[in-house]
Interface confidence: low
């Protein structure tokens, strides 16, 4: 007789999600003998890289690589040693690096080079660091959500693969520098750039996706700050009693605030700005972020971008979840309808700094920004994307599914490691009793 070696029990994959405000590392695992099953890949562990995103290291590229060391050291411990060499490692950068690439391509290249240098020092199967397009970010987020919720195919008790009838879920992602909306649609695309055709497990999917650069939470806050400096001597979205010194260089260095940038300004000047707790003026300020004046297609979302009518149920994750969760949990406000979401935003915007601090003890940092965040989410969904009360009823705000963070990272890895076959598995699993 000869020894029969057991197949390796688990495989692992690592994705570094290099967002605009921070980087997160996700380690995924799956049974090696079930690679083509759906919903079989799950999150093994994760790690938040402290500090800013890699794009914040434009002046210090080596620091971008160095910043990842703590999490990579954790990966060495979290992935069994004998699996290190066979574990694919990817880094994907999103809108923060897309912005840096627009304004300073040399710095963008230097940051990616530095990050690559660090990642190649580790014993994993490093497969590249690159900037994702907005379209990829949207589609991979959609793939992640539907994969985790097992919306693509299901494994029946008779051992046959079948596609469930529940359909797919749309995905809405609110990052730091961009926001994405992606959903399955039957409408033909009037703008080919917004349509993606996918073949997964033998099924064909026509998906609409669009990424709005500069509409991520952090960039929106910067743009509102720039607008407040331009049009008011106060910030209507900040609470009354809150005051801070704003460094003009920080406000105007982003390409997202270029429209509000004065012809000449002292980048090292500090301007004192106070809040006024004015929900109506804040709403007006947020409204100014959206343009509905021209649409070259039969219908648009905003800024002249084609969008078919929203259809089906949606999962809204990342900062959509954090914003709504703050209203729901920290503030104790109902947000089940669009009307309630608007009322909740107004409620937060009405609070003074002292009232907010009393309502949410121990969470003072950035507390002043929740009003603007809530107002933006409400306007983006209702006016921007065109959700009415009925459609909004089908939106769930959730950051995890099947104990795994929802975001583009898992979908990206599934795609690059071919863990979702285009065609259904050739062999049936189990026994056929029919």
């Amino acid at each position: 007789t000869r020894d029969i070696r057991e197949p390796p029990a688990l495989k692992y994959g690592i994705v570094l999600d290099a967002g605009s405000s921070h980087t997160s590392m996700f380690i995924y695992k799956w049974p090696a003998d079930k690679e083509n099953d759906t919903g079989i890949v799950g999150q093994h562990s994760s790690c938040d890289v402290p500090g800013g995103g890699i794009s914040s290291y434009a002046d210090n590229p080596s620091g971008a690589g160095q910043s990842l060391v703590g999490c990579l050291e954790q990966a060495l411990r979290d992935v069994p040693k004998e699996r290190h060499a066979g574990t694919p490692l990817y880094l994907g950068a999103t809108a923060g690096m897309r912005l840096l690439n627009l304004t300073n391509p040399e710095a963008s290249t230097s940051v990616l080079t530095a990050v690559t240098h660090t990642l190649t020092q580790y014993p994993f199967d490093f497969r590249g660091a690159r900037i994702l397009s907005g379209q990829e970010e949207g589609v991979f987020g959609w793939v992640t959500a539907n994969y985790l919720l097992e919306n693509f195919i299901k494994y029946g008790w008779v051992g046959r693969w079948f596609r469930p009838r529940k359909g797919t879920l749309g995905a809405m992602d609110l990052g730091g520098a961009s926001t994405q909306i992606t959903f399955e649609t039957t409408s033909p695309a009037e703008d080919r750039a917004s349509e993606v055709q996918l073949r997964l497990y033998g099924q064909h999917y026509r998906v609409y996706t669009h990424s709005f650069l500069c509409y991520g939470r952090d960039q929106v806050l910067q743009r509102l700050l720039a607008s407040a400096l331009q049009t008011h001597s106060f910030h209507p979205c900040w609470p009354r009693g809150f005051s801070t010194h704003v460094l003009l260089g920080d406000v105007y260095q982003s390409p997202c605030t270029v429209a509000q940038r004065p012809q000449t300004f002292n980048s090292s000047a500090r301007v004192s700005l106070s809040g006024s707790s004015d929900p109506h003026l804040c709403r007006d300020l947020v409204s100014g972020l959206f343009s509905f004046s021209s649409c070259p297609f039969s219908r648009c979302s905003f800024n002249g971008v084609f969008q078919p009518p929203v259809a089906g149920n949606f999962i809204a994750f990342s900062a959509f979840f954090y914003t709504v969760n703050f209203l729901r949990t920290s503030m104790g406000l109902p947000v089940a309808t669009l009307q309630q979401l608007e009322a909740a935003a107004v409620n937060v915007c009405n609070q003074t700094w002292a009232q907010l601090q009393a309502r949410v003890p121990g969470q003072q940092a950035h507390l002043a920004d929740y009003c603007a965040g809530a107002m933006f989410v409400q306007q983006l969904l209702s006016r921007g994307y065109g959700f009415d009360e009925r459609a909004f009823g089908g939106v769930i705000f959730q950051k995890k599914a099947a104990d795994t963070a929802v975001g583009w990272a898992l979908g990206y890895m599934l795609n690059l490691t071919n863990l979702i076959p285009a065609d259904p598995p050739g062999l049936r699993k189990g026994t056929d009793f029919s």
Epitope: G51, G52, R217, G362
Partner: antibody, heavy 125, light 106 residues
Framework: QVQLVQSGAEVVKPGASVKISCKAS????????MDWVKQAPGQRLEWIGD????????TYNQQFKGKATITVDKSASTAYMELSSLRSEDTAVYYC??????????????????WGQGTLVTVSS | EIVLTQSPATLSASPGEEITLSCSAS?????IHWYQQKPGQAPRLLIY???NLASGIPARFSGSGSGTFYTLTISSVEPEDAAVYYC?????????FGGGTKLEIK
């Protein structure tokens, strides 16, 4: 109340090792990382490393890799740091510090909210 | 690593005076914390995330700043404020501290 109590001062010979302890009380020990910080005479504070007591995961400042080993005894709510191959430049006060945090939009922001009283380690022949 | 430079190294102030301590980073950081250390004692958290007052810290302490420049202000110095003040960044690994500013009360 939340307290970190460290072991007493140590005088050790060059080349030897020393293990100092930090006993936590007043909170759930496994809910917070424990960090160690060095303060040499006339020098700035230096972060050495930390440990996640829940998962026994430690991370080190590259400068202290091989010098410091951080461990925990969960049942005793105690963190330990062993310093090896001691030299005169290791003479310092060593602090344990609890890593406090707050969550904002899903990102953890960290700081040292509670400190031990410090342990003086003197390396002398 | 990010180097934090604090100035002045030593500062002498009279009770009731307003003073400002500065902390300059060698490259941009997201936020910083401030700690106070009195002789023979461990450091104590004063301000976290640039401008948030830690529990039990008097309102005369305030912090501000962004990017590479941060300040700690004491609006009306009291005798018990005599201490060394350290800034600390948690934006870039390894986490680093400033060299400290020693505040003496006249």
């Amino acid at each position: 109340q939340v307290q970190l109590v460290q072991s007493g001062a140590e005088v050790v010979k060059p080349g030897a090792s020393v293990k100092i302890s930090c006993k936590a009380s007043g909170y759930t020990f496994t809910d917070y990382n424990m960090d160690w910080v060095k303060q040499a005479p006339g020098q700035r504070l230096e972060w050495i490393g930390d440990i996640n007591p829940k998962y026994d995961i430690s991370t080190y400042n590259q400068q202290f890799k091989g010098k410091a080993t951080i461990t925990v005894d969960k049942s005793a709510s105690t963190a330990y740091m062993e310093l090896s191959s001691l030299r005169s430049e290791d003479t310092a006060v060593y602090y344990c510090a609890r890593r406090g945090f707050f969550l904002y939009y899903g990102i953890n922001y960290y700081y040292f909210d509670v400190w031990g009283q410090g342990t003086l380690v003197t390396v002398s022949s | 690593e990010i180097v934090l430079t604090q100035s002045p190294a030593t500062l002498s102030a009279s009770p009731g005076e307003e003073i400002t301590l500065s902390c300059s980073a060698s490259s941009s950081v997201s936020y910083i914390h401030w700690y106070q250390q009195k002789p023979g004692q461990a450091p104590r958290l004063l301000i976290y995330s640039t401008s948030n007052l830690a529990s039990g810290i008097p309102a005369r302490f305030s912090g501000s700043g962004s990017g590479t420049f941060y300040t700690l202000t004491i609006s009306s110095v009291e005798p018990e404020d005599a201490a060394v003040y350290y800034c600390h960044q948690w934006s870039s690994y390894p986490w680093t501290f400033g060299g400290g500013t020693k505040l003496e009360i006249k």
